[in-house]
């Protein structure tokens, strides 16, 4: 697992591996902050629950993140 | 709305290209797929193609079917090589609906299928 | 054969309640949502449950799903003529990186 707790940000690789967002479970968008510079997104695979960091900058992580934005946009009174 | 095209009378062994046009929303933007039903059988799921260009295929099709899109003419193909007898089915291509909740920083994304097209018919017959 | 499995048929009188059942395994049902699809032949598919159990605006609240592990169930209460189709099942299945069908139900109104 590509995390680690005694860096300041939690994650240490970056996975260039291709994710199917039908097999995410689930996908934490931790924001750049004061411990770490870069926001992180945290791939959780349906598949034994495997964590993966994944890169931001991709095609696939923006188009998903797209539809995170439209949630929040939902959400927002 | 999407209308498919391109079916026909095909010889094994032979190629077709299958054409899907939509209208309302763009291909571009949206994870897209094509389901086949053979006579007298049931749904069967052939490929799938999502917004980042990756694609997917049933084992059944791997290396004998290319799934595409032209966004300038919003527009999803088929590209089917080889074909065999079992192969002979109504194609239909449909539109994934993807939709996201979210519980505390975590969120959850699921998909299916809203949209579909009426289908055409491909016969693979000598 | 089916990843999923359905009975092949289901029958009921107008009014009565029929019930579809859907069987997986932990790669799809059990890891995933269920989406149910409402087909007459020579049409398009139609959608008419996703997320286990919501229902898309148009279908009657007659229709009604629920997942449970590795299994989901279609009911339909208050049979009408015109629900006599065939009726499937499908998840994504993670083992085998694809979209799984069942072999549908036909249902049938007396």
């Known amino acids: 697992v590509p995390l680690s707790r005694t860096v300041r940000c939690t994650c240490i690789s970056i996975s260039n591996q291709p994710v199917n967002p039908r097999s995410l479970e689930k996908l934490e968008i931790i924001p750049a902050s004061q411990f770490c510079p870069r926001v992180e997104i945290i791939a959780t695979m349906k598949k034994k629950g495997e964590k993966r960091c994944l890169n931001p900058e991709s095609k696939a992580i923006k188009n998903l993140l797209k539809a995170v934005s439209k949630e929040r946009s939902k959400r927002s009174p | 709305q999407l209308v498919e095209s391109g079916g026909g009378l095909i010889q094994p062994g032979g190629s077709l290209r299958l054409s899907c046009a939509a209208s309302?929303?763009?291909?571009?933007?949206?994870?897209m797929n094509w389901v086949r039903q053979a006579p007298g059988k049931g749904l069967e799921w052939v490929s799938s193609?999502?917004?980042?260009?990756?694609?997917y295929y049933a084992d059944s099709v791997k290396g004998r079917f290319t799934i595409s899109r032209d966004n300038s003419k919003n527009t999803l193909f088929l590209q089917i090589n080889s074909l065999r007898a079992e192969d002979t089915a109504v194609y239909y291509c449909?539109?994934?609906?993807?939709?996201?909740?979210?519980?505390?920083?975590?969120?959850?994304?699921?998909?299916?299928?809203?949209?579909w097209g009426q289908g055409t018919l491909v016969t693979v017959s000598s | 054969q089916s990843v999923l499995t359905q009975p092949p048929s289901a029958s009921g009188t107008p009014g009565q309640r029929v019930s579809i059942s859907c069987s997986g395994s932990?790669?799809?049902?059990?890891?995933?949502?269920v989406n149910w699809y409402q087909h007459l032949p020579g049409t398009a598919p139609k959608l008419l449950i996703y997320?286990?159990?919501q229902r898309p605006s148009g279908v009657p609240d007659r229709f009604s799903g629920s997942k449970s592990g590795t299994s989901a169930s279609l009911a339909i209460s208050g049979l009408q003529s015109e629900d006599e189709a065939d009726y499937y099942c499908?998840?994504?299945?993670?083992?085998?990186?694809?979209?799984?069908f069942g072999g549908g139900t036909k249902v049938t109104v007396l």
């Open positions: 449909a539109r994934d609906k993807e939709y996201v909740t979210s519980t505390g920083g975590a969120y959850y994304y699921f998909y299916y299928m809203d949209v």
């Open positions: 932990s790669s799809n049902i059990g890891s995933d949502t």
């Open positions: 499908a998840a994504w299945d993670d083992s085998l990186n694809g979209l799984v």
């Open positions: 997320n286990n159990n």
């Open positions: 309302g929303f763009s291909v571009s933007d949206t994870y």
């Open positions: 193609i999502y917004s980042d260009d990756s694609t």
